[in-house]
């Protein structure tokens, strides 16, 4: 009985299409597949950013795979051919590994890259990113931001920079159609007549960096002799009510009475007849049903009642 062997895939490579971290891994079928003509060959692909402890593993019948990587680091990948037992009339067979790597040759020292990059998607409508210039770079250094997400034909450059002392320190993005719930890739590179500038790469999903507007129309309603209902409305904009969490801060007679997190636009408060003053503020955040993370809004304007019997009326500012 001769042992059945299969070769690894040929021409395994990582291709950078210029999407700032979204790379193509591609290969060709192994040599001498003629013996397995009636056979569906599969490929096991393992890949990771260099320095990562874990490999990502996929099995595919294709000759390519696409995924996102951190281009601040190198990438390594390996692939082998898999034959299920139906191909060999015996046991499953796998080839040796074919391996490849990819990295962008870094220019400049790390200190020259932008510092403290911060991106916020205001009210799920307007993306703004800001940064500080690299350490020790001269005023002739300018930074340029490029971005890409699936749906764009190619990476785009920022067209509305925020400037300080003639340097780009931020970007106001245009309307970004169909850009949430997918990886959003950014590269900030730079140029200087004095010295080369290191590029920086960032990846995030827009729904996870949303800072909503604060809630509006805060009201009080007396529910019973010892209960007051606090109500507010969701802020204007595209974020649906089901996507909000709220934090309320209530002060009774200058003492913090309650801080609470709620999912609805109401909160019922137990009070005493002695209450002379009641104030509350609310802020909002996108909840776990709509994102993995988020940023609290600013606090709403304060809504207060004072000097009248709370039981006598509904209070509306």
């Amino acid at each position: 009985d001769t042992e059945i062997k299969v070769n690894p895939p040929q021409d395994f490579e990582i291709v950078d299409p210029g999407y700032l971290g979204y790379l193509y891994l591609q290969w060709q079928p192994p040599l001498s597949l003629d013996h397995f003509k009636e056979c569906t060959v599969e490929y096991e692909l393992k890949y990771r950013n260099i320095g990562s402890e874990t490999w990502k593993t996929i099995i595919t019948k294709n000759l390519h795979y696409k995924d996102g990587f951190d281009l601040n680091k190198g990438i390594e990948a390996k692939i082998h051919t898999l034959l299920p037992w139906q191909c060999t009339n015996g046991s499953e067979v796998q080839s040796s590994w074919a391996e490849t790597t990819y990295w962008i040759s870094p220019q400049g020292i790390p200190e020259t890259k932008v510092q403290d990059m911060d991106c916020v998607y205001y009210n799920w409508q307007y993306l703004l990113c800001s940064w500080k210039p690299g350490i020790g770079v001269l005023l002739d250094t300018n930074y340029n931001l490029f971005y890409w997400y699936e749906g764009l034909d190619h990476a785009l450059q920022c067209v509305d920079y925020i400037k300080a002392d003639g340097q780009n320190i931020g970007c106001r993005f245009p309307y970004l159609e169909a850009s949430d719930y997918k990886d959003f890739y950014i590269c900030v590179n730079g140029s200087s007549e004095n010295k080369p500038i290191r590029s920086s790469y960032f990846t995030f999903q827009l729904q996870n960096i949303v800072k909503p507007l604060p809630p509006v129309y805060l009201t009080f309603t007396r529910e019973s002799s010892c209960e007051i209902k606090l109500k507010w409305s969701i802020p204007l904009g595209p974020i649906p009510a089901r996507c909000f969490d709220y934090e309320i801060e209530i002060r009774e007679d200058d003492t913090t009475l309650v801080t609470a997190t709620v999912e609805n636009e109401t909160y019922t408060l137990k009070t005493t007849n002695e209450t002379r003053q009641l104030c509350f503020v609310v802020r909002s955040k996108v909840n776990i049903y709509c994102s993995d993370d988020g940023i609290w809004s600013e606090w709403s304007d304060k809504q207060c009642w004072e000097g009248e019997d709370l039981s006598k009326k509904t209070l509306l500012r």
């Epitope: 569906t40 096991e44 996929i58 294709n62 046991s91 499953e92």
Partner: antibody, heavy 121, light 108 residues
Framework: EVQLLESGGGLVQPGGSLRLSCAAS????????MSWVRQAPGKGLEWVSG????????YYADSVKGRFTISRDNSKNTLYLQMNSLRAEDTAVYYC??????WGAGAFDYWGQGTLVTVSS | DIQMTQSPSTLSASVGDRVTITCRAS??????LAWYQQKPGKAPKLLIY???SLESGVPSRFSGSGSGTEFTLTISSLQPDDFATYYC??????????FGQGTKVEIK
């Protein structure tokens, strides 16, 4: 006749562990990749994990990676799913399924009757 | 991950009707698609594999077609036994293997 018989389901508290078994008969077990697929009450099908015929390749859905371990004992024609750190969202009927053709997963031509796992305090 | 989207979610039909269920993949999966039938309280049953191959023992009124990203399951003449939920599933690239959300075929 191909048969797959799951066992080991039951009620468990959040954070607890269970081990599911699937006894296979009627086919050459060691040759076929196998998978676990679950179905939460009133919901659709969700693939959980797969394993190659030899047991050398194991694959997981992100939702269970690091918590569940698939294994097989080809001498006993049995597939296993060790479930640790269970959560309420793991509540489902768990099916074992035989892969019709392929290395680690594929179309599933035979399914067990399912075993119910309930995670609740 | 490859997403699978089925339509419609629910389909009301009568015995004898020709029924078509559609499954769309978020990227090309060639012909690596299966269709299953599931009845309440029972395990799924394989109907079609490799997009168009009829599983042994499945009535010929079931057929599958399509490749790439668009697939259909057709029941040429709906029978009383066919009222069930149907799922598509891709096995082109994994993990994960992914299923459509299901289409319930109910009596009109």
């Amino acid at each position: 006749e191909v048969q797959l018989l799951e066992s080991g389901g039951g009620l468990v508290q959040p954070g607890g562990s269970l081990r599911l078994s699937c006894a296979a008969s009627g086919f050459t077990f060691r040759r076929y990749a196998m998978s676990w697929v679950r179905q939460a009450p009133g919901k659709g099908l969700e693939w959980v994990s797969g394993i190659s015929g030899s047991g050398g390749g194991t694959y997981y859905a992100d939702s269970v990676k690091g918590r569940f371990t698939i294994s097989r004992d080809n001498s006993k024609n049995t597939l296993y799913l060790q479930m640790n750190s269970l959560r309420a969202e793991d509540t489902a009927v768990y099916y074992c399924a035989k892969v019709r053709y392929g290395w680690g997963a594929g179309a599933f031509d035979y399914w067990g009757q399912g075993t119910l796992v309930t995670v609740s305090s | 991950d490859i997403q699978m989207t089925q339509s419609p979610s629910t389909l009301s039909a009568s015995v004898g009707d020709r029924v078509t269920i559609t499954c769309r993949a978020s990227q090309s999966i060639s012909s690596w698609l299966a269709w299953y039938q599931q009845k309440p309280g029972k395990a799924p049953k394989l109907l079609i594999y490799d997009a168009s191959s009829l599983e042994s023992g499945v009535p010929s009124r079931f057929s599958g077609s399509g490749s790439g990203t668009e697939f259909t399951l057709t029941i040429s003449s709906l029978q009383p036994d066919d009222f069930a939920t149907y799922y598509c599933q891709q096995y082109d690239t994994y993990p994960p293997i992914t299923f459509g959300q299901g289409t319930k075929v109910e009596i009109k």
